[in-house]
């Protein structure tokens, strides 16, 4: 059953202090409009019991598992039916609380009546303020029966309902004729869909034998335990002041659960908390009584004492509900009341037992719901107990239900039933949703509807390029967060699938359906700024550019340089594959050609705006070599070079370049510019004494020409070490190029 409790605070001296609280112990309850469950609803149900309109009630959510209703201004606001709805999907459950006015003419002896199909139900309305008029009984707001006021028995009006059936369930009321409906006695009748001790379709299945006032649910055979008890059969008492299916909730306030009415899912109904009774749940149990509404009697044996919250507290050497079992009788120890496994797994189940004589492996057996008996494959024997381990065959859905561990020795036998829930691993029913895309990443929402059972513990996203045979890439993500798939290829389709897992071994479900998601390739928007170009030869051009500053990362994969030769109608394209590049050397161009040059940023196959075009004229082939180069030593640090101009020049010479190198030296040669092209001689100064040098030279028009012949000459002897060669008297800073 759904773990849902509706608490009513019955301290009625001041209606403004009255509150109703709905508490859910369900995983993911009340989280709102996400994929894991609708919110808790708590409201007054005016369909049957209508009260005068008043100020609206205040609903307050305390975290995701609790909702409280306040704001009652007068006692009449309280009278009627309240309901709390919680749980998701097929487990959505309504818990109902019926409130009677303490000052009503008629009061119910017992508000909630849970009966079995075919039983006789008796509703008893006690006279609180007598009126000498007939009593009208209504069922779900419609007239049902009239009793003459003389028919009161012992100050009570009784309504007998023989052979009740599930449709008879609902809200019943007893009202004096012509009295205010608010003075009625309101009842709730719950008719189980089966006879006593039975459940399931056709009522063929046997209930587990719910203890401590627990009620067997007619649909799933589970025990709905009274507040303050837990376990598959409600066999275990919670600590005082605790409630909920796992005793996880605590009653508010210093006086624990005093003054609180607890309403649980049908077929339980409502009662006081364990250890309390009375119309306002403010009276402690009388000695010898315990449990919800103090309905249970202890009847402790063998020196056991009665605790009004938990029942018999046994002295050492005894156990059992009434301390009737000697510890010499074998006893199943610490058996979990409920176990959960995933479909098609082969779990190991342990069952521990103690007793005298000591249980051995063969004396412990495990019985499945279909009656199959499993024998243990091994046993661990310890001084105080024997633990038998059972290897369960591959689980199927039909294995869900009550299993039993049984121990038998000559000292007697004990058995413990426990519930096994076989859960179906979740399988996505839909593909994941694409939220946003970029050129190298996709943002995906993995939250999808699924078949099978939750809760979802992990979400795996599998992805790979469309039509690829490569392995799938996998990313494990938090179920509630969006996922960013990174380092993808731009403008590429990816097949993306979700795989969900629930807790436990074998909880991974099958992969969901694939969806195709394509990475983006936004068009680059930046226009490069052409800084200039440098003619490095008749067929070589170095180009420099830059970009304007933009916020955020640069959108681009590289640059495309285009050279358009209009004369020949040819385009040369140079791809620079780094978006960080700002220069490029273009080689293999046609000398003497007029080119139009521009630069564009590209991204995938998209081109951004081109820089404004520049008109570049490459020089024709360089001039011929200077003729008759001759070298003559002038001193220990100076050598004069003389030459004749080249013949058949294509244009005016802009400069000469002299190359100087020490003969046999390993170092780089030195280049010196002669900026006055009309000259036919120059003096190279700053040379080392007694050193042999090699010289050659070439002319430049717009590009450098051919080298002349190489000449050798030595400086004169015994000079000082010089700083380095210079041409004439000017250091060739600008023209010097290593």
């Amino acid at each position: 059953a759904v773990d849902l409790t509706l608490l009513a605070n019955l301290r009625l001296t001041d209606p403004q202090r009255f509150f109703l609280t709905c508490v859910s112990g369900e995983a993911g309850a009340g989280r709102g409009s996400d994929a894991w469950g609708p919110p808790l609803l708590l409201e007054k149900d005016d369909r049957i019991v209508r009260t005068p309109p008043g100020p609206p009630l205040r609903l307050a959510r305390n975290g995701s598992h609790q909702v409280t209703l306040r704001g009652f201004s007068k006692p009449s606001d309280l009278v009627g039916v309240f309901s709390c709805v919680g749980g998701a999907g097929a487990r959505r459950t309504r818990v109902i609380y019926v409130h009677n006015s303490p000052g009503a003419h008629l009061l119910p002896d017992k508000v909630t009546h849970t009966v079995n199909k075919g039983d006789t139900a008796v509703l008893s309305a006690r006279v609180h303020k007598e009126k000498q008029t007939d009593v009208i009984w209504k069922s779900n707001g419609s007239y049902f029966y009239t009793l003459d006021w003389h028919e009161a028995q012992d100050g009570r009006f009784l309504l007998q309902l023989p052979n009740v059936q599930p449709p008879s369930s609902g809200i019943y009321s007893a009202t004096y004729l012509e009295a205010s409906p608010l003075g009625s006695a309101f009842f709730r009748l719950i008719v189980r869909g089966c006879g006593a001790g039975r459940w399931g379709p056709g009522c063929t299945k046997e209930c587990p034998g719910c203890l401590h006032g627990g009620v067997c649910h007619d649909h799933d055979g589970e025990c709905v335990c009274p507040p303050g008890f837990t376990g598959t059969r409600c066999e275990q008492a919670c600590r005082e002041g605790r409630f909920g299916q796992s005793c996880q909730e605590q009653c508010p306030g210093i006086s624990g659960c005093r003054g609180l009415t607890f309403c649980l899912p049908d077929p339980y109904g409502c009662s006081c908390g364990s250890g309390w009774r009375g119309s306002q749940c403010q009276e402690a149990c009388a000695p010898g009584h315990f449990g919800a509404d103090c309905r249970l009697q202890c009847q402790c044996q063998n020196g056991g004492t009665c605790d009004r919250f938990s029942g018999c507290v046994c002295p050492s050497g005894w156990h059992g509900v009434h301390c009737e079992k000697s510890d010499r009788i074998p006893q199943i120890l610490n058996m979990a009341s409920e176990l959960e496994f995933n479909l098609e797994t082969m779990p190991r189940i342990n069952c521990a037992a103690a007793g005298n004589p000591f249980p051995v492996r063969g004396s412990i057996e495990l019985r499945k719901p279909d009656g199959t008996v499993l024998l243990s494959t091994k046993a661990i024997v310890e001084p105080e107990k024997t633990t038998a381990e059972f290897e369960v065959p591959r689980l199927v859905l039909a294995d869900s239900g009550f299993w039993e561990c049984r121990v038998s020795t000559s000292g007697g036998q004990d058995s413990r039933r426990f519930k096994v829930n076989v859960k179906v691993p979740p399988v996505p029913l839909a593909a994941p949703r694409l939220l946003t895309k970029q050129s190298r990443q996709l943002v995906v929402s993995p939250l999808v509807s699924f078949s099978g059972d939750g809760p979802i513990s992990t979400v795996r996203l599998h992805y790979r390029p469309q039509d690829s045979t490569m392995d799938w890439s996998t990313i494990v993500v938090d179920p509630s967060e969006n996922v960013t798939l990174m380092n993808l290829r731009p403008k590429t389709g990816y097949s993306v699938r979700v795989q969900l897992s629930r807790p436990g071994e074998g909880g991974e479900g099958a992969w969901g359906p694939p969806t195709l998601m394509t990475t983006d390739c936004p068009e680059p928007l930046l226009q490069p700024w052409l800084e200039g170009w440098h003619v490095e030869g008749t067929d070589r051009l170095r180009v420099s550019w830059s970009l304007p500053l933009v916020p955020g990362p640069l959108v681009g994969d590289g640059f495309l340089l285009r050279l358009w030769d209009g004369t020949r109608g040819q385009e040369r394209r140079e791809n620079v594959s780094s978006p960080q590049a700002r220069t490029a050397l273009l080689t293999g161009l046609t000398p003497g050609t007029h080119y139009q040059l521009d630069v564009q940023l590209y991204h995938c196959t998209l081109l951004g705006p081109a820089s404004p075009p520049a008109h570049v004229l490459l020089p024709p082939s360089g001039p011929p070599a200077p003729r008759h180069l001759h070298a003559q030593a002038l001193s220990d640090s100076e050598i004069q070079l003389t030459w004749k101009h080249p013949e058949a020049l294509p244009g005016p010479i802009s400069k000469y370049v002299v190359e100087v190198q020490v003969a046999g030296g390993a170092g780089d040669p030195l280049w010196i510019d002669v900026d006055r092209p009309e000259e036919t001689s120059t003096i190279i100064r700053g040379l080392n004494a007694s050193t042999r040098y090699l010289f050659r030279m070439r002319a430049s028009i717009q590009g450098l020409g051919d080298w002349s012949n190489t000449v050798e000459e030595s400086t004169l002897g015994n000079g000082l070490q010089a700083e380095g060669p210079v041409q004439e008297s000017r250091a060739a800073e600008e023209g010097l190029d290593q």
Epitope: W529, L530, L549, Q580, A614
Partner: antibody
Framework: EVQLLESGGGLVQPGGSLRLSCAAS????????MTWVRQAPGKGLEWVSV????????MYADSVKGRFTISRDNSKNTLYLQMNSLRAEDTAVYYC?????????WGQGTMVTVSS | DIQMTQSPATLSLSPGERATLSCRAS??????LAWYQQKPGQAPRLLIY???NRATGIPARFSGSGSGTDFTLIISSLEPEDFAVYYC?????????FGQGTKVEIK
């Protein structure tokens, strides 16, 4: 020898105008972007404006946008900076420089003083 | 705009000592950083371009390093003529921006 030579600086009143020139020699002027950089007395360097090799595209610092205009005459190997609506904070040495990746060649600068 | 921050503002050293100047960019400028030297009354002179390349005619005692946002200029052994103000400048994007300068003075 590669050289840049600025001229046209001087004293001008706030709101007035001035035109700076920069004569280039020793390199193919029309192949390179050119820029103006200024330096207020005792302060650091501040980029002012830049123009592409063919003069078709220009950029300005926010502090001078709408008041200064950069231009060039490739036939005369000359760069210009027309400065209008001058303010006291425009007082600085103005340098022209060649743009080749970095600013690889600089002129010696010309002083502009804006004062009443 | 990309902000360039130089440190220290002033460096007091003796000739022959090693000088280490730092420059930090407010966002990555790849390796597109230049260093300039400026002596009083003179125009700036390009020393290093693209973070580590020496300009023509610059002595080997000047070296640059770094990429992204952090850059360093090292003068391995200070000569008397090296005492000046040094500026870094990013050339990754327009507008070009300079650091505020580091003054290297004689101790």
């Amino acid at each position: 020898e590669v050289q840049l030579l600025e001229s046209g600086g001087g004293l001008v009143q706030p709101g007035g105008s001035l035109r700076l020139s920069c004569a280039a020699s020793g390199f193919t002027f029309s192949h390179y972007g050119m820029t103006w950089v200024r330096q207020a007395p005792g302060k650091g360097l501040e980029w002012v404006s830049v123009i592409g090799p063919s003069g078709g595209n220009t950029m300005y610092a926010d502090s001078v946008k709408g008041r200064f205009t950069i231009s060039r005459d490739n036939s005369k190997n000359t760069l210009y900076l027309q400065m209008n609506s001058l303010r006291a904070e425009d007082t600085a040495v103005y340098y022209c420089a060649r743009v080749w990746g970095a600013f690889d060649i600089w002129g010696q600068g010309t002083m502009v003083t804006v004062s009443s | 705009d990309i902000q360039m921050t130089q440190s220290p503002a002033t460096l007091s050293l003796s000739p022959g000592e090693r000088a280490t100047l730092s420059c930090r960019a407010s966002q990555s400028v790849s390796s597109y950083l230049a260093w300039y030297q400026q002596k009083p009354g003179q125009a700036p002179r390009l020393l290093i371009y693209d973070a580590s390349n020496r300009a023509t005619g610059i002595p080997a005692r000047f070296s640059g390093s770094g990429s992204g946002t952090d850059f360093t200029l090292i003068i391995s052994s200070l000569e008397p003529e090296d005492f000046a103000v040094y500026y870094c400048q990013q050339r990754s994007n327009w507008p070009r921006t300079f650091g505020q300068g580091t003054k290297v003075e004689i101790k």
